[in-house]
């Protein structure tokens, strides 16, 4: 129960007080109490319960005609079951007993009222009166918890605006109050009660830049809202009528959880005596809410597809057709950038993250712009946010960036469970260098104190700086299957290609040409292939940065190694001893539902069919999946990427709640 | 074959910044490897600066490591070299030079460590 | 001081071979292939003449050979003539926190 104030009696005149409905009041009947007195008996209006604990150990015993010894030990606590109709309505009238002098009494006058703060505390999409009988201060995890949530207003319901929702003190439409969390003030109090006493809602000054309250004012044609607290007012006085009122008001959320912002924020009313105009107001009563910001949550390959986006760029019509089938196929929206909108910028996958938000009200996609900043730069903020599209970008928006701070360096595991600990929405997996040195890249610590923060997906650091471009996408990918834990996850595997090579060779095909029918392409043989020294001592460098991130992973996703699945890919070390596909990176795939978009490899074609293909579909076939293989060699292999780079996918959310986790 | 023009270089003051520009012309420089390499009045060539051709890793000397940044924006076939702090010692020739990045041999690393086309240079004169 | 160490001339004449030495450490020269040679006339800017220890570039005369030893890379000049008078510095790639070195650079003089 809700803690209300002391109340001190005295028997030189009556006291005032008021009392608020759920709390409970502590009595100070001891320090000033007659001298010569020993004992006392209480006797309350019947809308009042009294408690009487003598301790300790306490033995408690509600009021009634008995007397009580007159010490410190005695607590003595008052609730009160209805609001009054009138100011002082109700009574307490305290007896003080000495042994030579007659009883003298102390009398208490008590003004019982309703006041509540409501929010959806229960998680249910509703707002239910409380009561205060559940503590609202806390927010706790997991399926038996409790506490409100907020979501960032960060889309765009004005289409006429460039700015979020967020960013403005307005409220534009319906749409706009659906993206806030509604929280009511309820009170109950005489008709003249706050004419001697004020409400006031408040937030603590460190998270008003993180929220905004709208009051809603019911007018005769329609309701408007008005801000109420915000950036610039930590307070606000509320104009409250006397008797039975409910008051809507509308909470946003400014900002995600970041590392100097746990997501937490808790808004106050306080009830403050103003009777006497020559003393500043005093505090009677507080209630508060806690929320939580909703954190931003990225969705795997395994969940269902719903919007592809790829880029048109010059003569890539055939790489787009097969991109179009695919989505096609996975019914999927498909959206293409433009040429004149891109700048030449293919690389849709680097440019940003889309995942979601969700508050047990509304869930709201929402796209992570990467910091990278080319050609593509104004695509998620003009393209994509939008009417219940969200967007959040961090980093340094001008330089001071890497190639790591790219999105193909960001990629979320299927839900997993660890050692007995569930991830139930999964964890995220970004590329590092193994140790930091004067040129090592890493993702910019803003982006990972980001990722970090969001706290349901506890992020995974991978080592992905021997690569070239450094993405983790260029050795990774996870597929969904039928069995197990539910996903595949497939590794670029030198291994296992050179094992097929020796295998063909084996069989007499060491002719059998890489690259054949790619003009201006110089073909290799398997035997040439296999026999290069140079490219062997690479590869085996590959295998053993690729098995360094297999054994992480085996351990921070609980795998076995029955839950991966090599595909064949050999690479070759440019500059800088820096790694890159040596034929069409095939672990680099766009998976749509069980239709995979697989990056053509141009193997050695061996009784009409490539090699490569060929494995790679029989690895991913019996899971039920469908491989559809793309030629992206000219448009996107030779520009040091492939399909999973030039696509990016909106995804269904989790079916399951990130509120209803423990992280 | 690629060419290439420096410019951005000038006098200024120790402690000041200068960016100096690389464009490329005849051929489209997301296809090369780019070095920006320095040559101080009367003296030898030293080695200052690298950006691999996919714009995704960038190496320094350590004499500039934290004042200089190199970028590129391919879009307008360029490679930038930002210039901070600058020290009377950074007073030099600076050129820019390439290496071409499409090559087809099975494995041929080293056109990163080597310049095959230069620029004529830009004079820096870092002086109070 | 440079890090790779070069003479700081050598002179020859028409028709003669030069060569000049470029000494460096097991963790560059010693290391990897990757010893480029550039030519320098004076107010031009250097040109590539030999990469990967002993490369040509195209357009390059075959009077200009590399070869490497150890931790000592060579530039081999034969048949000597007028044009050849410049400055030439060596290159390696590095495993040091600076990737790329130069030599000193050597004065040509053809007599």
């Known amino acids: 129960m809700a803690q209300g104030t002391l109340i001190r009696v005295t028997p030189e005149q009556p006291t005032h007080a008021v009392c608020v409905l759920g709390t409970l009041t502590q009595l100070d009947i001891c320090s000033s109490a007659p001298e010569d007195c020993t004992s006392f008996s209480i006797n309350a209006s019947p809308g009042v319960v009294v408690d009487i604990a003598h301790g300790p150990p306490a033995k408690k015993k509600s009021t009634g005609s008995s007397t009580w010894p007159l010490d410190p030990g005695v607590e003595v606590t008052l609730t009160m079951k209805v609001a009054s109709g009138s100011t002082g309505d109700q009574k307490v009238q305290i007896s003080y007993y000495g042994p030579k002098t007659p009883p003298v009494k102390a009398l208490l006058y008590l003004t019982g009222v309703e006041i509540s703060l409501c929010a959806d505390i229960t998680r249910t999409g509703k707002v239910k009166p409380t009561r205060a009988v559940k503590d609202q201060r806390t927010w706790t995890w997991g399926p038996c918890g409790q506490g409100a949530i907020l979501l960032v207003n960060c889309d765009r319901d004005n289409l006429e605006s460039s700015a979020m929702d967020c960013e403005d003190d307005e409220v534009l439409d319906s749409e706009d109050l659906q993206d806030m969390s509604l929280m009511t003030l309820s009170t109950k109090t005489p008709k003249d009660f706050f004419t001697n006493h004020t409400l006031v809602l408040h937030v603590a000054r460190s998270e008003m830049d993180k929220v905004r309250v709208f009051q809603a004012t019911r007018g005769k044609l329609s309701s408007k809202c008005s801000v109420v607290l915000g950036p610039k007012w930590p307070s606000h006085y509320l104009m409250v009528p006397g008797g039975k009122h409910n008051m809507d008001f509308y909470v946003e959320a400014l900002a995600f959880p970041d590392t100097d912002f746990p997501g937490l924020i808790t808004l106050t009313i306080s009830l403050l005596d103003t009777s006497n105009l020559e003393l500043p107001e005093a505090v009677v009563f507080q209630d508060s809410v806690v929320f939580r910001v909703a954190p931003w949550i990225m969705t795997p390959n395994t969940q269902p597809p719903q919007e592809v986006y790829a880029c048109s760029i010059f003569e890539n019509e055939d790489f787009l057709k097969s991109v179009t089938t695919l989505a096609m196929k996975a019914k999927c929206k498909l959206t293409i950038c433009p040429e004149e909108e891109n700048m030449d910028d293919q690389w849709m996958q680097d440019e940003m993250e889309i995942g979601y938000i969700q508050a047990p009200h509304k869930t709201l996609p929402v796209v992570f712009d990467s910091p990278r900043n080319r050609g593509l730069k104004e695509f998620p903020i003009k393209r994509v946010m939008g009417p219940d599209f969200g967007y959040v970008t961090r980093g340094p928006q001008t330089g001071g960036i890497s190639g790591l701070d790219s999105f193909g360096n960001l990629e979320v595991s299927p839900p997993v469970t660890v050692r007995g600990k569930e991830y139930p929405l999964g964890r995220i997996l970004f590329g590092d260098s193994c140790y930091p040195s004067n040129d090592s890249r890493q993702m910019h610590q803003a982006l990972q104190d980001f990722l970090s923060a969001q706290q349901v997906q506890a992020p995974v650091k991978l080592y992905s700086d021997w690569l070239s471009v450094g993405h983790v996408d260029e050795f990774l990918s996870f597929v969904p299957a039928p069995d197990r834990k539910g996903f595949r996850l497939l590794l670029a595997s030198p291994r296992s290609c050179y094992k097929l090579f020796q295998e063909q060779q084996n069989e007499g095909h060491g002719e059998a040409l890489l690259f054949e029918g790619i003009k201006k392409k110089k073909q290799q043989k398997i035997k040439n292939i296999l026999s290069n020294k140079t490219l062997r001592e690479h590869n085996s460098f590959v295998e053993r940065c690729i098995d360094w991130n297999r054994e992480l992973l085996k351990r921070e996703l609980g795998l076995a190694e029955s839950d991966i699945i090599d595909i064949p890919q050999l690479f070759k070390l440019k500059e800088f001893s820096k790694a890159e596909a040596f034929f069409p990176n095939m672990v680099n795939m766009l998976v749509l539902g069980k239709h995979l978009g697989i990056p053509k490899p141009f193997g050695p074609v061996i009784n009409g069919r490539c090699c490569l293909e060929e494995k790679v579909c029989s690895l991913l076939e019996p899971l039920g999946l469908q491989c559809t293989f793309i030629n992206d060699f000219f448009t996107y292999h030779i520009r040091h990427g492939e399909v999973h780079c030039g696509t990016n996918v909106r995804r269904k959310p989790f079916s399951f709640k990130w509120w209803n986790m423990v992280p | 074959q690629v060419q290439l023009v420096e410019s951005g270089g000038g006098l200024v003051k120790p402690g000041g910044s200068l960016r100096l520009s690389c464009a490329a012309s005849?051929?489209?420089?997301?296809?090369?490897?780019v070095s920006w390499i320095r040559q101080a009045p009367g003296k030898g060539l030293e080695w200052v600066s690298f950006?691999?051709?996919?714009?995704?890793?960038?190496y320094y000397a350590d004499s500039v490591r934290g004042r200089f940044t190199i970028s590129r924006d391919n879009a307008k076939n360029s490679v930038y070299l930002q210039m901070n702090s600058l020290r009377a010692e950074d007073t030099a020739v600076y050129y820019c030079?390439?290496?071409?990045?499409?090559?087809?041999?099975?494995?041929?690393?080293?056109?990163?460590?080597?310049?095959?086309?230069w620029g004529r240079g830009t004079l820096v004169t870092v002086s109070s | 001081q440079s890090a790779l160490t070069q003479p700081r001339s050598v002179s020859g004449s028409p028709g003669q071979s030069v060569t000049i030495s470029c000494t460096g450490t097991?963790?560059?020269?010693?290391?990897?292939?990757?010893v480029s040679w550039y030519q320098q006339h004076p107010g031009k800017a250097p040109k590539l003449i030999i990469y990967?220890?002993?490369e040509r570039p195209s357009g390059v005369p075959d009077r200009f050979s590399g070869s490497k030893s150890g931790n000592t890379a060579s530039l081999t000049i034969s048949g000597l003539q007028a044009e050849d008078e410049a400055d030439y510095y060596c290159?390696?790639?590095?495993?040091?926190?600076?990737?790329?070195?130069f030599g000193g650079g050597t004065k040509l003089t053809v007599l």
């Open positions: 030079s390439s290496a071409n990045d499409d090559v087809d041999d099975i494995v041929a690393p080293g056109r990163g460590y080597y310049m095959d086309v």
């Open positions: 005849g051929s489209t420089l997301s296809d090369y490897f």
């Open positions: 950006i691999s051709s996919a714009n995704t890793f960038t």
């Open positions: 097991s963790g560059d020269v010693g290391r990897y292939n990757h």
């Open positions: 990967n220890v002993y």
């Open positions: 290159s390696s790639h590095s495993r040091s926190s600076t990737p790329v070195l």
